[in-house]
Interface confidence: low
């Protein structure tokens, strides 16, 4: 027993004064704690602890399970211990079959002996199987057998503690080692969708998938810039021994506009952390926004093709789309398709293909789209550029020469006089009157221009040219004059 100098508190003394005691099963255990300040006896073996406030610990008929460490403590908190082995030929080992080992750490197979005098205290594989070659262990009769540096490959290893008693090998109950893997990488996290768009009152539900080697990975949903605890539900699976998957589902049963924001799924283990985010946008009602991909005023030459193209955002999904011209709906010549195949897509494209446009096909082309909440439209003003066409060229009774031309853009009419029989006219003649005849008519289609000159100004034989032109092209008509004496005679005009 320990000795200390007088004046200092000393640990209690135990009788018998031994560090170890061996008792046969059925015999008495009698331990006396000698200390004026005795407080209690404590018995410990494996996970079990018992206490006794009597200074004499008596067990009348000792059982194997009374094997363990008996500690006497005094009021100063000082203690002394004796280890008692209760030798029971029928029960050589005390066992706690729960056996967990952390990868790369040591773990204790808890099978303390009830008889310290046996030999070959060691581990054996079940059913005669050998232990892994690299498995190292250290036996301790009072605690069990420590497996050094547990490997992941030892998971589900079946073991017995073994000892030789009176020449026979005795095995304990079997142990199954469960290895808790060490984290050697950060968790793998993914989210069901990167963004969500909802209307007020709709349910928001998003699932984060966390994958790691074991279930002790920590995970949580967080709202960025907020400390509010979010409601989550979990499902989990073990796909094999070291392949764990958890699904953490975050739900807001009736989303509001102020729920909009970024939500982060965060996971960490002892190696490190990982996160993934999803964005929620909640709108008070649905919407449609249309973006023309070409100018809404379109000029196209006669006989050419043009494509009217819009992109539009629609939420919820568009239900009805149509292209209209002159109160008529196109049944073909157009297509409508999503901009992306992503299920979060809200952007769409619509194209109207106009081919070999005629001058009469100018006008307003309208795209209409609607969903369950709103409808929207956009109009394209299509102008067909046409080369001027001379509709009439006449000598009026009042002696005026009149030329009427139609085209788009608005044609300009110039007059020329050619002396003699020359077809190449250079001398220009100023018109007496110019009018745009349909300026107040429909805004699309050809514009009609009328121009007149006074023929009395011409004193010689010759040709008068009426030339109508615009950006697209030009057209001419001719008047021939011949004088017989004093009479002026108009020859029929020609183009």
């Amino acid at each position: 027993q320990p000795s200390v100098s007088p004046g200092e508190p000393s640990p209690p003394s135990i009788h018998p004064a031994k560090s170890e005691l061996i008792v046969r099963v059925g015999n008495e255990i009698r331990l006396l704690c000698i200390d004026p300040g005795f407080v209690k006896w404590t018995f410990e073996i494996l996970d079990e602890t018992n206490e006794n406030k009597q200074n004499e610990w008596i067990t009348e008929k000792a059982e194997a399970t009374n094997t363990g460490k008996y500690t006497c403590t005094n009021k100063h908190g000082l203690s002394s211990s004796i280890y008692v082995f209760v030798r029971d030929p029928a029960k050589l080992f005390l066992v706690d079959r729960s056996l967990y080992g952390k990868e790369d750490n040591d773990t204790l197979v808890r099978c303390p002996l009830t008889d310290p005098e046996v030999t070959s205290y060691s581990l054996k594989g079940c059913q005669g199987k050998p232990l892994p070659k690299d498995l190292r262990f250290v036996p301790d009769p009072k605690a069990g057998i420590t497996i050094k540096s547990v490997k992941r490959a030892y998971h589900r290893l079946c073991l017995h503690c073994s000892a030789d008693q009176e020449g026979k090998s005795v095995l304990s109950d079997k142990f199954i080692l469960k290895v808790r893997p060490a984290f050697k990488a950060v968790p793998v996290v993914s989210v069901s969708k990167a963004s969500y768009l909802l209307r007020e009152g709709e349910e928001f539900t998003v699932t984060c998938t966390i994958k790691d080697v074991s279930s002790s990975v920590y995970s949580t949903w967080k709202r960025e810039n907020s400390q509010t605890k979010l409601q989550e539900k979990y499902n989990s699976w073990h796909h094999g021994d070291f392949n764990y998957e958890r699904q953490a589902t975050l739900t807001i049963s009736s989303a509001r506009v102020n729920d909009s924001g970024v939500f982060m799924c965060y996971a960490n283990n002892t190696f490190g952390s990982a996160n993934v985010t999803t964005t929620l946008e909640v709108v008070d009602k649905g919407f449609i926004n249309i973006f023309p991909m070409i100018n809404t005023t379109v000029f196209v030459n006669d006989g050419e093709n043009v494509d009217l193209i819009v992109e539009y955002e629609a939420f919820p999904k568009p239900e009805h789309q149509q292209w209209i011209y002159m109160n008529r709906t196109f049944t073909d010549k157009w297509e409508d398709y999503p901009k992306s195949e992503n299920e979060s897509n809200i952007r769409y494209v619509s194209e109207l293909h106009l081919t070999r446009l005629k001058g009469t096909e100018g006008g307003t082309y309208t795209f209409l789209v609607s969903n369950s909440d709103v409808n929207a439209s956009i109009a394209f003003n299509v102008y067909v550029n046409t080369k001027p066409e001379i509709l009439t060229y006449d000598r009026l009774v009042n002696g005026m020469l009149q030329c009427v031309a139609a085209g788009f853009p608005e044609p300009t009419i110039d007059w020329y006089f050619c002396p003699g029989t020359e077809q190449r006219c250079s001398a220009s003649v100023l018109p007496v009157d110019v009018q745009t005849l349909n300026a107040s008519g429909p805004p699309f289609g050809k514009l009609v221009v009328q121009s007149s000159i006074d023929s009395s100004a011409f004193k010689h034989n010759g040709t008068v040219e009426c030339k109508a032109y615009n950006d697209v092209g030009k057209t001419s008509a001719y008047f021939n004059f011949a004088f017989k004496g004093n009479n002026k005679e108009q020859i029929h005009p020609h183009t």
Epitope: E48, N50, L94, D96, S98, K174
Partner: antibody
Amino acid sequence: EVQLVESGGGLVQPGGSLRLSCAASGFAFSGYYMAWVRQAPGKGLEWVANINYPGSSTYYLDSVKGRFTISRDNAKNSLYLQMNSLRAEDTAVYYCARGDYYGTTYWYFDVWGQGTTVTVSS
Amino acid sequence: DIQMTQSPSSLSASVGDRVTITCRASQSISSYLNWYQQKPGKAPKLLIYYTSRLQSGVPSRFSGSGSGTDFTLTISSLQPEDFATYYCQQGRRLWSFGGGTKVEIK
């Protein structure tokens, strides 16, 4: 599916014998302690006997010691209870139960059979 | 031998009620106590082991507490399927059961 199915019950006269069997499936039978628990008509549960997984250790309720023998055949995944010198008070439903440890020599019964009825009457 | 005494032997309760059943051991059994549920004509079913550990698949409305000699099983909100007889069992030295508590519909 983890399952225990008892058989062998019946009507027997006082002093007679019966042998109950329990067929285990769906788990590693040879790695578990097994027990018999009984329930007299209208009464509570009473532990009767148990056996360790190799079959080398057995324990009995005092009132059945010397009359009942528990045994097992790990190759056949079967548990047995040989009941001799039967008495009227042995009348009960007999359940086969799988025992498991938590901590040191601490038991609970986590899987039970549906029971077999033993009636001892003249 | 260790004797186990349960109380009450029977009780009447309604769906949604909080129900408490107690079990007393004749000597200390540390935390070595289990609870079972049994319905008429059926085998017992393990609910709780080692005083408070919920067996896999058992609803969280069941909970256990206590240590030494006094133990409690609590059903936080009684459901229709919970009407049954409940037994405690000690696993400290050999194995013995309490007399049972029958939970009936009020």
